[in-house]
């Protein structure tokens, strides 16, 4: 048997919102579940579709979903069928509509003292509650001789009089929400004695010193009074004109004329009509002084031939709004063609080189005229004047590669070296004409170079190979002064490169031959055991066929390298006592001693009274303080050699002797006591 585990149940739903009718079945065999609406099968749509066995609504529709839904489960093998309980939606909705005249039948039949009934066509479920408004102000039952029936959605005015004139609107709300009338009703009930507008003044824009005219007429029985006021409520009459309206004239027909308008005349003018009965009718019009601001500058524009381009002219701010037009070569552009004006835009369709030039945007109104030029360049693809060529450049000298092109606008040239963009630095310089200068050619500059010349219209490129002609040079140049340690083995290297591999030899500067214990092995001068006599001037000579020879002079000094006879020791001193840091070094030439304390060299000429460096190199510090603590370095150096040794200095407080300690008790650490 087919059993419903979940049955659909009737429920509230909201128009346009999601909803779900639930259905779940259990059966021994395979069952096919479908839905009925008022007995007819429900077809799946994007809005309403089956989800499992349930029926899902993406947006409930009060018209398409009204009725009775039923879930049907059918066993297609046995033919057994089960139907769920009926379920329906209580759909809540609200829909806006217009305010319409219900009585009398037409507006033409509305007369003073007749009954007027308006109907609010807002519908909804549950039945909405209505609220009426006149000129935006809520109306309540019994207010000013009208009867409001919000339940019946009607507003009855009995009897209707001129005081009921106005714009009638309605709003309604229910459980779904709120809606207001889509179209409102203007009720106009005339009273002959009320002032009625015949001619209303219009806003006026005039140029300075021009004249402005405002027309204003009212009608009523008996004829109404008419009065003009300006801005600050100052009345304007032919007898009493305010100082700033000396040139104002009020005509018998109600028109107001202002001559030779000045900025102070600009503002709001009120024309007031007062009938024998009823409220005053106030009409306003504004007098604006015409003005026009300057136009913003155009950036020069570069376009490519064959393309379509537009240039927008932003009109300057102005009153009245300025009219805009484009001119080229003194001729106004047409509104169609290949080069034409469309709105505020200059349109160039399928640009030709001949379109280049100055185009002018003009703007004008009552206040005057403004103009602004835009320079349009039509870009062309560059052409060659001089391509880069394969070149041999000399090492150490400046080298040039040319890339001369012409185009409109002036092309930009970039260079690549081994496919890498060359950025200008101290060695590379790209001239305005596109030439690349290599300031100091180096061996590794021998590679491929490519130049690319571009404009917005396109680009051209060419490449060239650079071969570097290597100069004859020492690599590296020998140090001009070198030291050798006495009685030790020593070598002095010398190497060179050139376009051809150079031969290298050493000789003594005085021309004498090298002793037998000194050998010249492929440019390396080798001393088996250095003697005092080996000191002197030597020359390294490098030569090849095409480039000749070069020489490097070296002065060799023989020295006994520095050793320390006495080195400073780790020292601890009581505060206020004297510290002695000993240092003595030997070597040839005789070494000089310098001290470094707290990471700075101690200058003997600026030591002050507490410090002193003795002839033998020892450092003495009197009246030591805690800030003297630190690492002290003894540096011994001569023209050939430099050595250093260091020791820490600790400054400590002198302990107060305890009673148990005898006068001769030793301190707890090694001390210098003075």
């Amino acid at each position: 048997a087919i059993v419903f585990i979940k049955q659909p149940s009737s429920q509230d739903a909201l128009q346009g919102r999601r909803a779900l009718l639930r259905c779940e079945v259990e059966a021994p065999g395979l069952v096919h579940v479908y839905w009925l609406l008022d007995g007819a099968p429900v077809q799946d749509t994007e809005r309403r579709f089956t989800q499992g066995s349930s029926l899902s609504f993406a947006a409930v529709d009060r018209l398409q979903d009204s009725g009775t839904f039923q879930c049907v489960a059918r066993d297609d093998v046995t033919g057994e069928e089960a139907r769920s309980a009926n379920a329906s939606f209580n759909i809540k909705w609200i829909e806006a509509g217009p305010v319409v005249l219900k009585h009398p039948a037409s507006e033409a039949e509305i007369q003073p003292q007749t009954q007027v009934t308006l109907r609010c066509h807002i519908d909804g479920h549950p039945r909405p509650t209505y609220q009426w408004f006149r000129d935006g102000t809520p109306l309540s039952d019994g207010q000013s001789n009208n009867t409001v029936s919000s339940k019946e959605r009607n507003l009855t005015l009995r009897p209707a009089g001129p005081e009921h004139s106005g714009l009638y609107s309605c709003c309604a709300h229910n459980a779904f929400g709120q809606a207001c009338s889509s179209q409102n009703f203007t009720l106009s009930i005339a009273d002959e004695s009320f002032a009625r507008v015949v001619l209303a003044p219009q806003d006026v824009i005039v140029a300075r010193n021009e004249e402005a005219m405002f027309h204003c007429q009212f009608s009523a029985q008996p004829p109404p009074n008419l009065q003009w006021l300006f801005e600050d409520e100052t009345p304007i009459t032919n007898r009493s004109r305010p100082p700033h309206l000396r040139r104002a004239t009020v005509f018998a027909n109600g028109s107001l004329l202002l001559t030779q308008v000045r900025p102070r005349n600009a503002g709001v003018y009120r024309c007031i009509g007062q009938g024998q009965r009823g409220p005053p009718v106030i009409l306003e019009a504004t007098l604006h002084l015409a003005e026009i601001e300057d136009m913003p500058l155009f950036e020069p524009r570069v376009f490519t031939a064959g393309s379509e381009e537009r240039v927008t002219c932003l009109p300057p701010k102005g009153l009245p709004e300025p009219s805009v037009w484009w001119e080229h070569a003194g001729v106004r552009l047409p509104t169609h063609g290949r080069v034409y004006q469309k709105g505020h835009e200059l349109v160039l369709a399928s640009i030709a080189e001949s379109d280049a030039g100055v185009y002018t945007c003009h703007a004008a109104n009552l206040a005057g005229q403004r103009r602004q030029d835009v320079n349009i360049t039509v870009a062309t693809v560059p052409t060659w004047l001089k391509k880069p060529q394969d070149s041999q450049l000399e090492e150490g000298k400046p080298g040039y590669l040319h890339c001369l092109t012409q185009a409109t606008p002036k092309p930009t040239v970039v260079w690549y070296r081994n496919q890498m963009l060359i950025s200008e630095d101290s060695r590379f310089e790209v001239f305005k004409n596109g030439t690349l200068r290599i300031n100091n050619v180096e061996v590794y500059d021998g590679t491929w170079y490519r130049c690319v010349s571009s404009t917005p219209a396109g680009s051209i490129e060419a490449q060239a190979r650079v071969q570097v002609l290597e100069k004859l040079k020492f690599t590296p140049p020998p140090q001009p002064q070198q030291c050798m340690e006495f009685d030790k083995e020593a070598t002095v290297p010398c190497s060179a490169t050139g376009r051809e591999k150079p031969t290298i030899k050493w000789e003594r500067a005085d021309g004498s031959s090298l002793p037998e214990w000194v050998t010249d092995n492929a440019g390396t001068l080798h001393f088996a055991r250095v003697t005092r006599d080996d000191a002197g001037n030597y020359t390294c000579i490098a030569s090849n066929g095409p480039q000749g020879q070069i020489r490097a002079h070296v002065q060799l000094t023989v020295a006994v390298f520095i050793t320390f006879k006495v080195e400073p020791e780790r020292t601890t001193v009581y505060q206020g006592h004297t510290a002695l840091l000993q240092c003595e070094a030997q070597g040839d030439p005789k070494p000089l001693i310098q001290w470094k304390g707290k990471d700075r060299i101690l200058d003997p000429t600026k030591l002050g009274p507490r410090m002193h460096i003795f002839q033998n190199g020892s450092l003495v510090i009197h009246d030591v303080a805690p800030e003297d603590s630190g690492r002290y370095t003894c540096i011994a150096g001569n023209s050939c050699n430099i050595k250093h040794t260091e020791a820490p200095l600790y400054v400590v407080d002198k302990p107060v002797p305890e009673e148990s300690e005898g006068p001769g008790s030793p301190p707890p650490y090694k001390m210098i006591q003075t």
């Epitope: 659909p8 149940s9 009737s10 429920q11 509230d12 999601r18 459980a175």
Partner: antibody
Framework: EVQLLSSGPELVTPGASVKISCKAS????????INWLKQSHGKSLEWIGD????????VYNQKFMAKATLTVDKTSNTAYMELRSLTSEDSAVYYC????????????WGQGTTLTVSS | DILLTQSPAILSVSPGERVSFSCRAS??????IHWYQQRTNGSPRLLIK???ESISGIPSRFSGSGSGTDFALTINSVESEDIADYYC?????????FGGGTKLEIK
């Protein structure tokens, strides 16, 4: 992870208005209704209304129609409720909650915003 | 509006006991009832939807039953962490409404 983050506590004077927010994260904001509920101290919950973040269309409990205005800002995945003409009766904890697809039950809740109306 | 009446207002049980909360609707609402737990100073948490459907992440000791107008929430074996207020909510008619709640206390 679905999260609703309510704005901090508010202390306002009678007659004033207040706008509280609820920032959603961890799911597609426009796919689910955001509901607003009121719980006065020691009392049960009252449903104020809900809003469809996709269309911005609210539905109100009639009781709160003149009191609450529901809005959303899709760009910041944030729902707002403005309460106006406040009185001491409006002092409560206000929750935002995300419903299931149909908006019939509330499976994710904000931590609540405490509103105190006092002179 | 549909009125949901929860009874009793307070339930006092010992840990391990079985407990049932009742919720009665003022009219037939099918199975459109949902149950929530709210611990002190916390936000409500959905326990059961559509009268009997379980919610992922909710312990299996919570179950729901009923249709039409009478509904129940059952905790099979009460634990100390179940101390809270329990509310039912209907989604059959607008506006959606909640019951007055039942407070669960541990003896």
């Amino acid at each position: 992870e679905v999260q609703l983050l309510s704005s901090g506590p508010e202390l306002v004077t009678p007659g004033a208005s207040v706008k509280i927010s609820c920032k959603a994260s961890g799911y597609t904001f426009t796919d689910y209704y955001i509901n607003w509920l009121k719980q006065s101290h020691g009392k049960s919950l009252e449903w104020i209304g809900d809003i469809n973040p996709n269309s911005g269309g609210p539905v109100y409990n009639q009781k709160f129609m003149a009191k609450a205005t529901l809005t959303v800002d899709k760009t910041s995945n944030t729902a707002y409720m403005e309460l106006r003409s406040l009185t001491s009766e409006d002092s409560a904890v206000y929750y935002c909650a995300r419903g299931d697809y149909y908006g019939s039950n509330y499976n994710y809740w904000g931590q609540g915003t405490t509103l105190t109306v006092s002179s | 509006d549909i009125l949901l009446t929860q009874s009793p207002a307070i339930l006092s049980v010992s840990p391990g006991e079985r407990v049932s909360f009742s919720c009665r609707a003022s009219q037939n609402i099918g199975t459109s009832i949902h149950w929530y737990q709210q611990r002190t100073n916390g936000s409500p948490r959905l326990l059961i939807k559509f009268a009997s459907e379980s919610i992922s992440g909710i312990p299996s000791r919570f179950s729901g039953s009923g249709s039409g107008t009478d509904f129940a929430l059952t905790i099979n074996s009460v634990e100390s962490e179940d101390i809270a207020d329990y509310y039912c909510q209907q989604s059959n008619n607008w506006p959606y409404t909640f019951g007055g709640g039942t407070k669960l206390e541990i003896k």
